[in-house]
């Protein structure tokens, strides 16, 4: 039974490779999937000597290890590309690295949007 999952309809979208892949660079993505399948948001990034380089953000298809995650938290120690997923609209706005070996928790906040 899937109890009380947060329904994901929209995610923050970002693509660092937007020019080559001919997509938008950033914005919102409306998630679409098959009936009876859950949807998630994700974020992926690199960490080069403490400098965070966003790779992609967007919608993620039904993946059991993403179920019931309210926050986007990556736990791998030192991957080439960090990955996290979560459930709930725009839950991938902030993302966190919480290494399994018990290192410091690092949360990445989106830059404040400039007033229009």
């Amino acid at each position: 039974s899937g109890r009380g999952e947060a329904e994901t309809r929209e995610c923050i979208y970002y693509n660092a490779n937007w020019e080559l892949e001919r997509t938008n660079q950033s914005g919102l993505e409306r998630c679409e999937g098959e009936q009876d399948k859950r949807l998630h948001c994700y974020a992926s990034w690199r960490n080069s000597s403490g400098t965070i380089e966003l790779v992609k953000k967007g919608c993620w298809l039904d993946d059991f290890n993403c179920y019931d995650r309210q926050e986007c938290v990556a736990t791998e120690e030192n991957p080439q590309v960090y990955f996290c997923c979560c459930e709930g609209n725009f839950c991938n706005e902030r993302f966190t690295h919480l290494p399994e070996a018990g290192g410091p928790e690092v949360t990445y906040e989106p830059p404040p949007t400039a007033p229009t």
Partner: antibody, heavy 118, light 111 residues
């Protein structure tokens, strides 16, 4: 090093109950979905049940629905499978497995044997 | 009820190439089912070989590769060795928490 250690198997009469445990170490248990998979003697692998990181979502194969209950205690790093109304066809080695992104089983325990016989 | 099908048995000569397949009764296998492959020798726990269609698990030699062939998932072993003689299982993730195993393929390495 990731370790999954199942226990609680044994011989039980038809209609009886058992509770299997899987003690996890070497990874952040509360951050991993988990699953139970079984293998009857001389047969193939069969997915039995899965539970999300919080325990809020649980799923079962049709043949065990209403008889088996999967649960987890994240403070004890332990996964459980409560098996009631056991039948001869539930006789199998039961494995616990860690579920990773892309919904695959990245680590397996060594298994515990459940025998249902009178 | 979803049934995932694999060849019951297969033989390969040492050094040869073999492709095992994994299909199901209600359509074509695609990457959205996250096909994964596992190797099991008698009396042992399964070992993860391939996940997400074609990604090798850590420590798995590059003789093992995964793909989609037509409407099925496939596991190819190139340069087969004696210790590749095992049972091989595919798993498809159907969504909504449900995983389905194939019936398994018993691979024999001749000679």
């Amino acid at each position: 090093e990731v370790q999954l250690l199942e226990s609680g198997g044994g011989l039980v009469q038809p209609g009886g109950s058992l509770r299997l445990s899987c003690a996890a170490s070497g990874f952040t248990f509360r951050n991993s979905a988990m699953s139970w998979v079984r293998q009857a003697p001389g047969k193939g692998l069969e997915w039995v049940s899965a539970i999300s990181v919080t325990g809020g979502s649980t799923y079962y194969t049709d043949s065990v629905k209403g008889r088996f209950t999967v649960s987890r205690d994240n403070s004890r790093n332990t996964l459980y499978l409560q098996m009631n109304s056991l039948r001869a066809e539930d006789t199998a080695v039961y494995y616990c497995a860690k579920v990773y992104y892309y919904s695959f089983f990245d680590y397996w325990g060594q298994g515990t044997l459940v025998t249902v016989s009178s | 009820q979803t049934v995932v099908t694999q060849e019951p048995s297969f033989s390969v000569s040492p050094g040869g190439t073999v492709t095992l397949t994994c299909g199901f009764n209600s359509g074509s296998v695609s990457t959205s089912y996250y096909p994964s492959w596992y190797q099991q020798t008698p009396g042992q726990a399964p070992r993860t070989l391939i996940y997400n269609t074609n990604t090798r698990s850590s420590g798995v030699p590059d003789r093992f590769s995964g793909s989609i062939l037509g409407n099925k998932a496939a596991l190819t072993i190139t340069g087969a060795q004696a210790d590749d003689e095992s049972d091989y299982y595919c798993v498809l993730y159907m969504g909504s928490g449900i995983h389905v195993f194939g019936g398994g393929t018993k691979l024999t390495v001749l000679g």
